[in-house]
């Protein structure tokens, strides 16, 4: 159940895709990784407000509770709510594999 | 891929399952929620240093990526990598139903 | 496992159009870093790079027939097309889709055969 | 365009042989060559990326070198399912090119 789209802290501000451009040096992947040299990582960022695409009814409670307590109970976090499939060119023992991951770039965010 | 469960900023410091009591009226549910009066809520609470129970790649990036851009990627995050089941006794037009809900109670937690 | 299949391929006209279908399975066409491509042989002769389409609709042709090439996606329908327009005899040639992650061709179709002849 | 040449255009040779093939870039490529495998009547099978990376699946005995201009192919020793045409493509920039081809034939 994702609450409210509406970001009352500005536009752009609150939980919502962004892309990082990152090189295989960035990423500690150079040892392994052939291809790509560089990766648009789409990853999640940004403030939960109350009720601000809350992803399910443990975000709801954590907001009342963060509200109650704010230095015990954190505010939800931006997540991912699902993931885009890439594939890398690795290195292997014997050569190269195309191998898939399913669980590398954000596809879209929610908060918990 | 939880990678390390050893946290290096001292025992209790990282993301761990919390509990945390909580009244109906806490929680906001005193309108629509006849028992339980209090609930015992689990949550995930804590740092998550590099590597720290990982929840997949895209956490192991957001950790290379924080380390370079601290500024513009934030660390990853402790939230609920699983839920435990929590019945309520809710108010209805007609009266009360015992309903189910999936989502409400951590069980154990991750970075992402 | 991944298999490509090419088809609409047969006789065409000096001067008409060809229109091939490649549909494949084992992989999807939304996964970054994902392409496939097309590649020609003529008879007795070697590979011809074409045109290749990516994950994210980047397309690249083949310099000489850019101007004769389009390549599009239906990555629902797990297909890639190859249309080219105003075909000379020297067109005549098996062409192959393939499978491509990054700058690798990996998986290969069987061809399909054209023949352009009046 | 990149230009991809192969030498020899056919190779005869016998089983159990070592053969090495030879291809050159008509400028710097780095290390992206790729070497593939075709049979009569099939498809290009793909078996070395980047000048010296055997791709899954592909046997020891093939192996590939070089950077720059020249890059070289290498059959350790000959089995009778070899003898094929082989191409070389530069994958360092589009359009990708491909060699000419060499013919590894049974002498």
């Known amino acids: 159940a994702r609450n409210g789209d509406h970001c009352p802290l500005g536009p752009g501000r609150c939980c919502r895709l962004h892309t990082v451009r990152a090189s295989l040096e960035d990423l500690g992947w150079a040892d392994w990784v052939l291809s790509p040299r560089e990766v648009q990582v789409t990853m999640c960022i940004g403030a939960c407000p109350s009720q601000f695409r809350a992803a399910n009814m443990h975000a709801q409670i954590k907001t009342s509770l963060h509200r109650l307590k704010p230095d015990t109970v954190p505010a939800p976090c931006c997540v991912p709510a699902s993931y885009n499939p890439m594939v890398l060119i690795q290195k292997t023992d014997t050569g190269v594999s195309l191998q898939t991951y399913d669980d590398l770039l954000a596809k879209d965010c929610h908060c918990i | 891929a939880r990678n390390g469960d050893h946290c290096p900023l001292g025992p209790g410091r990282c993301c761990r399952l919390h509990t945390v009591r909580a009244s109906l009226e806490d929680l906001g549910w005193a309108d629509w929620v006849l028992s339980p009066r209090e609930v015992q809520v689990t949550m995930c609470i804590g740092a998550c240093p590099s590597q720290f129970r990982a929840a997949n790649m895209h956490a192991q990036i957001k950790t290379s990526l924080h380390r370079l851009k601290p500024d513009t990627v934030p660390a990853p995050c402790c939230v609920p990598a699983s839920y435990n089941p929590m019945v309520l006794i809710q108010k209805t037009d007609t009266g009360v139903s015992l309903q189910t809900y999936d989502d409400l109670l951590a069980k154990d937690c991750h970075c992402i | 496992q991944v298999t490509l299949l090419e088809s609409g391929g047969g006789l065409v006209q000096p001067g008409g159009s060809l229109r091939l279908s490649c549909s494949f399975s084992g992989f999807s066409l939304s996964t970054y870093g994902i392409g496939v491509g097309w590649i020609r042989q003529a008879p007795g002769k070697g590979l011809e790079w074409l045109a290749h389409?990516?994950?994210?609709?980047?397309?690249y042709f083949n310099t000489a027939l850019k101007s004769r090439l389009t390549i599009s996606k239906d990555t629902s329908k797990n297909t890639v097309y190859l249309q080219m327009n105003s075909v000379r005899a020297e067109d005549t040639a098996v062409y192959y889709c393939?499978?491509?992650?990054?700058?690798?061709?990996?998986?290969w179709g069987q061809g399909t055969t054209v023949t352009v002849s009046s | 365009d990149i230009v991809m040449t192969q030498s020899p255009a056919t190779l005869s040779t016998s089983p159990g042989e070592r053969a090495t093939l030879s291809c050159k870039a008509s400028q710097d490529v780095n290390t992206a060559v790729a070497w593939y495998q075709q049979k009569p009547g099939q498809a290009p099978r793909f078996l070395i990326y980047?000048?010296?990376y055997r791709y899954t699946g592909v046997p020891a005995r093939f192996s590939g070198s070089g950077s720059g201009t020249e890059f070289t192919f290498t059959i350790s020793s000959l089995q009778s399912e070899d003898f094929a045409v082989y191409y070389c493509q530069q994958h360092y920039s589009t359009p990708w090119t491909f060699g000419g081809g060499t013919k590894v034939e049974i002498k």
């Open positions: 393939a499978r491509m992650g990054y700058d690798i061709m990996d998986y």
């Open positions: 389409i990516w994950w994210n609709n980047n397309k």
């Open positions: 980047s000048s010296s």
